[in-house]
């Protein structure tokens, strides 16, 4: 139609220069098209150089988009991240802060002589809590061993007791049970809260990770011509009115965002998972339950060894011999009273149960967030047509949109006909990602039936996907028992640069 | 055999700050507390502080608090000693001390390293 | 804080002569005690913890006893090279408060 040929390119220019581009680069009216690399070749109001200007921006406006999605995800993980933490530390704090309260009235030098140790099992805690790489069994193990050979030498100041008696107590102590069944209890007990706990928070950890990870994958360049041709062919091709066509806006994002798709199964395992473990929290060896009593258990510990003193006594030196006698020591520690305790089974506060509920309905929202993402950005930021009929733009011109809309991920691209997808080479990052979520999911199946597993990143790219300090300094590497050599390994995923170490403590 | 190998002597001015390292040896780092205590010409000895190198948590001695810094580097198994606004006070030998089994009792110590604060 | 005191502060005594040494706290430290002994130049040498255990390599002329807040070290026989100066220290709690000392020299 020769009238068509001089139509005016106001409308273009308008929107040009809106988008911050000079206006002299475009026609007062509309020219041939042969020089158009990415839109259809027809009359167009558009030059080579605002073709390329417009595809860099609609690069730039989906990456963008795509980040601004993440960033709501990964803000929603951060706080649920932030407040459980928050909660289970504050659990843990106000147990020491029962105990540095109280054990000094019910327990006198027994506890003050020995206020280290105590402060120790607490710090270790608290770094097991926070993702130190260190066998929890053992710290209390260590604990209670230290805590004997001193409460031992408390309460036998008649008695010579060098390191080698001492030593030989240590190797009596798992068959005497010095402490009753406090250790054994907290030891099984502590061993599932902490678990659970800690690789609950780490699940959140990990999970925004990956989706922080996964939102700086550039888009390619395949992607790149799809997507100018989806939002401003229309305008260089002189239908600047035409909405995208849906289902061929979701063919576009489908092919873009193929590889993102493929994390869909391992994220809902992972969410699923995350959710599961929650019914860990509950009960007298869940997490509030068991980390807000810790002290109860050491109470009783102490109690029992000075109920069982004489027999103890009696039994350590029919395994280690008579000790000598110090000529110049007082008699035997007279027995203090009982160290009266509130009772171990803290009543819930409900802020746990608000927490859980509140996490659930949240992960239960997002379990689709992948492969839900084309068409949340379709509707959300593409300024769809209305409906699928034969006014929208499908890419070539207005009319109807014929192909089928692809399936989700990158091996149901093969046939995608807005995006040329090469499905054999999945995007590397993403792989890894997914093999975090995979490792993630492990661990929390793991933590459900009470066990801890060693937690090593798999991804191969040397980064792993910590979330930044997790780790002051070197807290990943674990204490050492002076009674083993087992190395200790840093961890990938501990908490997400959380609570500040305990750090500093002042006399 | 353990063994604890401190940094050289250090002249400092009043008001700088010195940092003393203290390298272990012979033993699992980790597995003990590390002691700073000092002892200034002609005095006796004074405890500075303690660090525990599994978990970097420490305990300074009040009258230290505001001007002392414990670390440790696990990597290479040395503390560190860091006091800072000095004056001609705290020109005093400073040694680092490793406990016998998590007692207090220091039954290892460096050599001492010798601080001098004169302008 | 717990603070130790020592007496004497300077002890004269002979190669053979039975020596003791005094430390007090201010606050029972029950059996948690030590004693250095370090001579001039040098870094402090554990010689008792545990107000009564000897440590080990350390010659059996050292001993130690007490409890609470009085706590003696005895030389039974004073060697030439027992003339130093013999701290005491609390090792119950921090901060871990050391004596003032005592000076043993020649007579």
């Known amino acids: 139609d020769p009238a068509s040929k001089s139509r005016s390119c106001g409308e273009v220019r308008q929107i040009y220069g809106a988008k911050g581009f000079s206006l002299s680069d475009v026609p007062q009216a509309e020219i041939s098209g042969e020089h158009l690399r990415i839109c259809p070749q027809g009359y167009t109001c558009c030059t080579s150089e605002m073709e390329e200007n417009l595809a860099n921006r609609s690069h730039a406006e989906l990456e963008t988009a795509l980040r601004d999605s993440s960033r709501v995800l990964q803000a929603m993980l951060a706080t649920q991240l932030r407040s459980f933490d928050d909660h289970f530390q504050h659990l843990l704090n106000d147990s020491e802060r029962t105990l540095q309260a109280t054990f000094p009235g019910a327990f006198g030098e027994l506890y003050t002589q020995n206020a280290r140790a105590f402060r120790d099992l607490y710090s270790e805690l608290r770094l097991y809590y926070r993702g130190a790489n260190l066998h929890l069994e053992e710290t209390l193990a260590e604990f209670w061993a230290r805590l004997l050979e001193r409460l031992f030498k408390q309460l036998h100041p008649q008695l010579l007791l060098p390191d080698d008696y001492l030593d030989c107590l240590g190797k009596q102590a798992e068959a005497l049970r010095p402490f009753g069944e406090a250790p054994r209890e907290l030891r099984l007990r502590a061993t599932r809260a902490f678990v659970a706990a800690r690789s609950f928070v780490q699940g959140l950890g990990v999970a925004s990770d990956v989706v922080r990870k996964v939102a700086q994958v550039p888009l390619g360049p395949e992607c790149s011509r799809a997507v100018m041709k989806l939002v401003y062919c229309a305008h260089c091709l002189g239908v600047p009115g035409a909405r995208p066509c849906p289902d061929y806006c979701r063919n576009v994002l489908k092919g873009c965002l193929a590889n993102q798709a493929d994390l869909d199964a391992e994220w809902r395992n992972l969410l699923d998972s995350m959710v599961l473990i929650t019914d860990k929290f509950w009960g007298t060896s869940g997490v509030e339950s068991v980390i807000g009593s810790v002290h109860t258990w050491l109470a009783e510990a102490i109690n029992a060894l000075q109920d069982n003193r004489d027999t103890l006594t009696a039994k350590v030196i029919q395994g280690c011999g008579n000790p000598k006698v110090n000529p110049q020591g007082p008699g035997p520690e007279e027995k203090r009273r009982r160290g009266k305790l509130a009772p171990r089974e803290r009543p819930p506060s409900g802020t746990l149960e608000k927490l859980v509920s509140e996490a659930k309905a949240q992960l239960r929202d997002v379990q689709d967030f992948w492969i839900s993402l084309p068409g949340t950005l379709c509707s959300e930021k593409m300024a769809l047509s209305t409906a699928s009929d034969d006014r929208c733009w499908n890419g070539m011109a207005r009319g109807r949109y014929l192909p089928e809309v692809m399936g989700d991920g990158l091996a149901n691209q093969i046939n995608n006909p807005e995006v040329e997808v090469d499905i054999t080479k999945p995007d590397m990052t993403i792989r890894q990602q997914i093999m975090q979520l995979k490792i993630m999911t492990n661990r929390l199946r793991s933590a459900y039936n009470g066990n801890d597993v060693d937690f090593q990143d798999a991804s191969d790219d040397g980064s792993g996907s910590g979330s930044g300090d997790g780790c002051l300094d070197d807290l990943c590497s674990r204490k050492v028992s002076r009674k083993s050599s087992s190395s200790r390994t840093p961890l990938t995923h501990a908490l997400p640069g959380l609570s500040e170490q305990e750090g500093q403590k002042t006399s | 055999q353990v063994q604890l190998v401190q940094s050289g002597a250090e002249v400092k001015k009043p008001g700088a700050s010195v940092k003393v390292s203290c390298k272990a040896s012979?033993?699992?780092?980790?597995?003990?507390?590390m002691h700073w205590v000092r002892q200034a010409p002609g005095q006796g000895l004074e405890w500075m502080g303690e660090i525990n190198p599994s978990t970097g948590d420490t305990t300074y001695n009040q009258k230290f608090k505001a001007r002392v810094t414990m670390t440790r580097d696990t990597s290479t198994s040395t503390v560190y000693m860091e006091l800072s606004s000095l004056r001609s006070e705290d020109t005093a030998v400073y040694y680092c001390?490793?406990?016998?089994?998590?007692?207090?009792?220091?039954?290892?110590w460096g050599q001492g390293t010798l601080v001098t604060v004169s302008s | 804080d717990i603070v130790m005191t020592q007496s004497p502060s300077t002890l004269s005594a002979s190669v053979g002569d039975r020596v003791t040494i005094i430390c007090r706290a201010s606050q029972s430290i029950g059996p948690w005690l030590a004693w250095y002994q370090q001579k001039s130049g040098k870094a402090p040498k554990l010689l008792i913890y545990?107000?009564?255990n000897l440590q080990s390599g350390v010659p059996s002329r050292f001993s130690g006893s007490g409890y609470g807040t009085d706590f003696t070290l005895t030389i039974s026989s004073l060697q030439p090279e027992d003339f130093a100066t013999y701290y005491c220290q609390q090792t119950s709690s921090a901060p871990f408060t050391f004596g003032p000392g005592t000076k043993v020299d020649i007579k």
């Open positions: 545990g107000a009564s």
């Open positions: 001390a490793r406990e016998k089994r998590d007692d207090g009792v220091f039954a290892y």
């Open positions: 012979g033993y699992t780092f980790t597995g003990y507390y």
